[in-house]
């Protein structure tokens, strides 16, 4: 298992919400990506292929997510101060072998300017 800080901008703020970007190498074809808040699984997305190369996308913990060819984005809405925490992208690579797990993360700072529906 590889642990480290994300070497890219992991948090993108917009409209009182945040897009959390979890990247994976282009070569990875089948994987599970989990978003952890501290040690708690908030979201997950699994991409696999069957014996005829049919792709299946599965989410056990439902979050609004977006898949591209080298990243999974998870979206959190209605930010408040309780969202401030360490967030980790926990990537399990099934294909290509060998099976590997990598963990990258960063701290989500919440500032007043990023909060939704501020009271004036």
């Amino acid at each position: 298992e590889i642990n480290g800080s994300a070497n890219y901008e992991m948090f993108i703020f917009h409209n009182g919400g945040v897009q959390i970007l979890c990247k994976y190498p282009d070569i990875v074809q089948q994987f599970k990506m989990q978003l952890l808040k501290g040690g708690q699984i908030l979201c997950d997305l699994t991409k696999t292929k069957g014996s005829g190369n049919t792709v299946s996308i599965k989410s056990l913990k439902f979050c609004h997510s977006q898949l591209s060819n080298n990243s999974v984005s998870f979206f959190l809405y209605n930010l408040d101060h309780s969202h401030a925490n360490y967030y980790f992208c926990n990537l399990s690579i099934f294909d290509p072998p060998p099976f590997k797990v990598t963990l990258t993360g960063g701290y989500l700072h919440i500032y007043e300017s990023q909060l939704c529906c501020q009271l004036k």
């Epitope: 699994t46 292929k49 069957g50 599965k58 099934f94």
Partner: antibody, heavy 117, light 111 residues
Framework: EVQLVESGGGLVKPGGSLKLSCAAS????????MDWVRQAPGKGLEWVGN????????NFAPSVKGRFTISRDNAKNTLYLQMNSVKSEDTATYYC??????????WGQGTLVTVSS | DIVMTQSPSSLAVSAGDKVTINCKSS??????????LIWYQQKTGQAPKLLIF???TRHTGVPDRFIGSGSGTDFTLTITSFQTEDLGDYYC?????????FGPGTKLEIK
Amino acid sequence: EVQLVESGGGLVKPGGSLKLSCAASGFTFSDYWMDWVRQAPGKGLEWVGNIDHDGNIINFAPSVKGRFTISRDNAKNTLYLQMNSVKSEDTATYYCARWGHYAFDSWGQGTLVTVSS
Amino acid sequence: DIVMTQSPSSLAVSAGDKVTINCKSSQSLLSSGYNYLIWYQQKTGQAPKLLIFYASTRHTGVPDRFIGSGSGTDFTLTITSFQTEDLGDYYCQHHYSSPPTFGPGTKLEIK
């Protein structure tokens, strides 16, 4: 240890129905696509069909499409093959197999289905 | 559908022989740098066992005398020094598209 155990095979008349089961253990069943593969006596291997983790995607070989259905019960760790309108050419040993992301890495011992009047 | 062919259909061999089994696909199995080609061994009365995936990667526990090679449409399984426990049928299979199909098999028999 991964184990797949098929059951439900036997003698069935042409046009009849039969339901095969495959009990899985030793791994997280819901994490894997599962397949059925058959082998006629003295012949080679023929893919029958597959099902994704939660049964949302099911594919069949042209030779069985419209006659066979595949389902799974993740709570019971069991895979099923419902065979309807069977023909003599469906006579075979039926194997359930785990698709381990890039190959069939585990197979059951097989169950023999004989279609004869 | 992709058609898989194998040659020879059967082969008589002796212990220590180098054995070569060929597999050909009706279209290229190469995608994103990987060949979607698998080899299985099946002994009499048993279920098939995985030997090689992605054309050349040995499955866990498979002896290193089994070597997979080839790319595109032409593939080879080589047993560098045949052992009597290697008797049985050998099948190639593609998983490039649906339906995944198997070759007709190659039977290895004792000379």
